[in-house]
C-alpha cells in the first residue's frame, strides 16, 4: 500500500493532465483527489502513465467506490481496465455497448479472459438478457467470447438472437454451453429447408440429442468428420452402423483416421464387428460375432 503523505502546495492537482506522469507514486496518492480523477477519467487513457502509477489511480478509485465503480467511470477506464481483477468487475453494473466495446478493445492482446468473461456477464445482467445487440458486439469485437459465458447466462439468449451467432463464435464452447444453445438454435431455424437447416444448425450440434442426430441421418446431410467428432458421446453411442454411414455419407471413410479418438472409439466398442466390417474400412474393436450383449443398466433399473 502507498504510504500517506501530505501534498506539497506546488504539486496540487487541479486537473488530470500530462504533468502527472512526472509525479512519484506517493505524490500521486497525496495530490490527486479521487473525485477529480473520477470526473476526468476520460483524460486518463491519453496520458502515458506507468503501470505503477496506474496502480495508484486504481487504488484511488477503489477507495472512492468500495461498492464498485459507476458506469460513467467504467466507460473511460481505458488501460486502467488491465489492472482490474474479476472480483473488481463483479461489483460493476454495466449496460452500455459503448462501454463493452471500449473495454474489449483495451483487453485485446492481453491475457484477460477471466476479466472479459466477468465483464460480459455483468453486461448480460445489466441489460436484462443476452440481447441481439450484445451478441453482435461480441461477434465483432471478441470472437469466441460468447463461450466465456456460463450455461446459466446463455439460457437468457432468446432464440431470435441465435441467427446473429457465427460458427467461429462457438469454437470454444463446451458441451454444457452447447446443451443450452442447441435447443434455441433448433427453434430459431425450424422453418428452414433441409440443406439450409443443416448449414445453420451444424455449429450447434455438439448439444444435439440422439434422436435429432438419428433424424439428420435420414436427410442426406453428409456430415463432415469435424462436426461428427464434436457430437456428444451419449448422442453417438446409440447410433447403428447404418445410421452413421447414412449420416456421414462420403465422409464415412474418415472414421478410420479417428478410430482411436472419442466418440468414434467408444461407438466402435458398442457395434457388432460384422456390422463394422460392412463399412470396409478395417475398423477393429467391435463386439465379436456370437457374443451376447447384456445391458445391465436396464436390469438394475427394473429391480
Amino acid at each position: 500500500d502507498v504510504e500517506r503523505t501530505t501534498c506539497p502546495p506546488e504539486k496540487e492537482v487541479h486537473e488530470i493532465d500530462e504533468s502527472l506522469i512526472f509525479y512519484k507514486k506517493r505524490e500521486l496518492e497525496a495530490c490527486v483527489d479521487a473525485a477529480l480523477l473520477a470526473a476526468q477519467m476520460d483524460r486518463v487513457d491519453a496520458i502515458p502513465f506507468t503501470y505503477e502509477q496506474l496502480d495508484v489511480l486504481k487504488h484511488k478509485l477503489d477507495e472512492l467506490y468500495p461498492q464498485g465503480y459507476p458506469e460513467s467511470v467504467i466507460r473511460h477506464l481505458g488501460h486502467l481496465f488491465l489492472k482490474m481483477s474479476p472480483e473488481d468487475i463483479r461489483k460493476w453494473n454495466v449496460t452500455s455497448l459503448e462501454t463493452l466495446k471500449a473495454l474489449l478493445k483495451v483487453s485485446k492482446g492481453h491475457e484477460m479472459s477471466a476479466q472479459v468473461a466477468t465483464l460480459i456477464d455483468r453486461v448480460v445482467v445489466g441489460r436484462g438478457q443476452l440481447d441481439k445487440d450484445t451478441v453482435d458486439t461480441l461477434t465483432a469485437f471478441c470472437p469466441g467470447c460468447l463461450c466465456s459465458l456460463s450455461p446459466e447466462r446463455l439460457s437468457s439468449v432468446p432464440p431470435s438472437v441465435i441467427g446473429a451467432v457465427r460458427p467461429q463464435d462457438l469454437d470454444t464452447c463446451g458441451p454444457r454451453q452447447l446443451d443450452v444453445l442447441y435447443p434455441k438454435a433448433r427453434l430459431a431455424f425450424q422453418n428452414m429447408s433441409g440443406s439450409e437447416y443443416f448449414v445453420k444448425i451444424r455449429p450447434f450440434l455438439g448439444g444435439a440429442p440422439t434422436e435429432d442426430v438419428k433424424a439428420l441421418s435420414q436427410q442426406n446431410v453428409s456430415m463432415d468428420l469435424a462436426t461428427f467428432m464434436k457430437l456428444r458421446r451419449e448422442a453417438v453411442l446409440p447410433l447403428t452402423v447404418a445410421e452413421v454411414q447414412k449420416l456421414l455419407g462420403p465422409h464415412v471413410e474418415g472414421l478410420k483416421v479417428e478410430e482411436q479418438h472419442s466418440p468414434v472409439r467408444d461407438w466402435i466398442l458398442k457395434q457388432r464387428q460384422d456390422d463394422l466390417d460392412t463399412l470396409g474400412l478395417g475398423l477393429q474393436g467391435g463386439i465379436p460375432n456370437g457374443y451376447l450383449i447384456l445391458d445391465l443398466s436396464v436390469r438394475e433399473a427394473l429391480s
Partner: antibody, heavy 119, light 110 residues
C-alpha cells in the same frame, strides 16, 4: 444554455430526398448519443437513428429505417439525417434528442422541424 | 426489436386523484426504462430514468417502479398541468432499442 435546434424541414414531393440538420449550442458535443425521433400528426414517438459522438462513431438504426435514412456527424456541433424516397407516411415532426454517453436517456430535445410529403 | 406496450389509453382522473400507467417490454430489460411527458406542440420531457430515478426538477408526485418486463408510472395528487401524453421507452443502446417507445397514454384530468 444547452440547446438543440433542428432545421431543413418543409414541403417536399413524394420520392424526393431531404437532409435535416441538428445544431447544438452551449453543449460539449463529444461523447454523447445523438438521435432522431419523429412524430406523425396525432401519433406517438418513433425512433429513427442514433449516432455515438465520440471514439467509435457507431450508428444504430430502427429496423424500419435501415437503408432509407442515414445519420451522420457533419461537424463538431451538427448531426444530420439524410432521408430518401420520401412518402406521405414520412410526414411528421422530426426531433433531435441527446442521449447520455451510455444510453438513450433523452434529457435534451430540440423543438422539432415539420416535414410534409405531399404532391 | 424490443416492443414496448402501454396501457391503458386514455386514462381519466380527477384533480387530486391518482393515475397508474403500465408499460410492458417484449423481453427482459432489467431497469432500462424511462418515462416522458409530452404536451401538444412541445417536445417530450424526461420524468423518470432507470425505471425509478426521478429526473432533477420533476415533482415527487411522479413515481416509477418495476423491473424486467413490467413497469409502472404512478402520478399522485393530480394537477391540471399533468394533462398530457406519457411515453415509456427502453433506454439501452443498440439497433434493437432505437425505436423502443411505447404507444403513449393520454392522461385526462377532470
Amino acid at each position: 444554455q444547452e440547446q438543440l435546434v433542428e432545421s431543413g424541414g418543409g414541403l417536399v414531393q413524394p420520392g424526393a430526398s431531404l437532409t435535416l440538420t441538428c445544431t447544438a449550442s452551449g453543449i460539449d458535443f463529444s461523447r454523447y448519443y445523438m438521435c432522431w425521433v419523429r412524430q406523425a400528426p396525432g401519433k406517438g414517438l418513433e425512433g429513427i437513428a442514433c449516432i455515438y459522438i465520440g471514439g467509435s462513431g457507431s450508428t444504430y438504426y430502427a429496423s424500419w429505417a435501415k437503408g432509407r435514412f442515414t445519420i451522420s456527424k457533419a461537424s463538431s456541433t451538427t448531426v444530420t439525417l439524410q432521408m430518401t424516397s420520401l412518402t406521405a407516411a414520412d410526414t411528421a415532426t422530426y426531433f433531435c434528442a441527446r442521449g447520455t454517453n451510455l444510453n438513450y436517456i433523452f434529457r435534451l430535445w430540440g423543438p422539432g422541424t415539420l416535414v410534409t410529403v405531399s404532391s | 426489436d424490443v416492443v414496448m406496450t402501454q396501457t391503458p389509453s386514455p386514462v381519466s382522473a380527477a384533480v387530486g386523484g391518482t393515475v397508474t400507467i403500465k408499460c410492458q417490454a417484449s423481453q427482459s430489460i432489467n431497469n432500462g426504462l424511462a418515462w416522458y411527458q409530452q404536451k401538444p406542440g412541445q417536445p417530450p420531457r424526461l420524468l423518470i430514468y432507470s425505471a425509478s430515478n426521478l429526473e432533477s426538477g420533476v415533482p415527487s408526485r411522479f413515481k416509477g417502479s418495476g423491473s424486467g418486463t413490467e413497469f409502472t408510472l404512478t402520478i399522485s395528487d393530480l394537477e391540471c398541468d399533468d394533462a398530457a401524453t406519457y411515453y415509456c421507452q427502453c433506454i439501452w443502446d443498440g439497433n434493437s432499442y432505437v425505436n423502443a417507445f411505447g404507444g403513449g397514454t393520454e392522461v385526462v384530468v377532470r
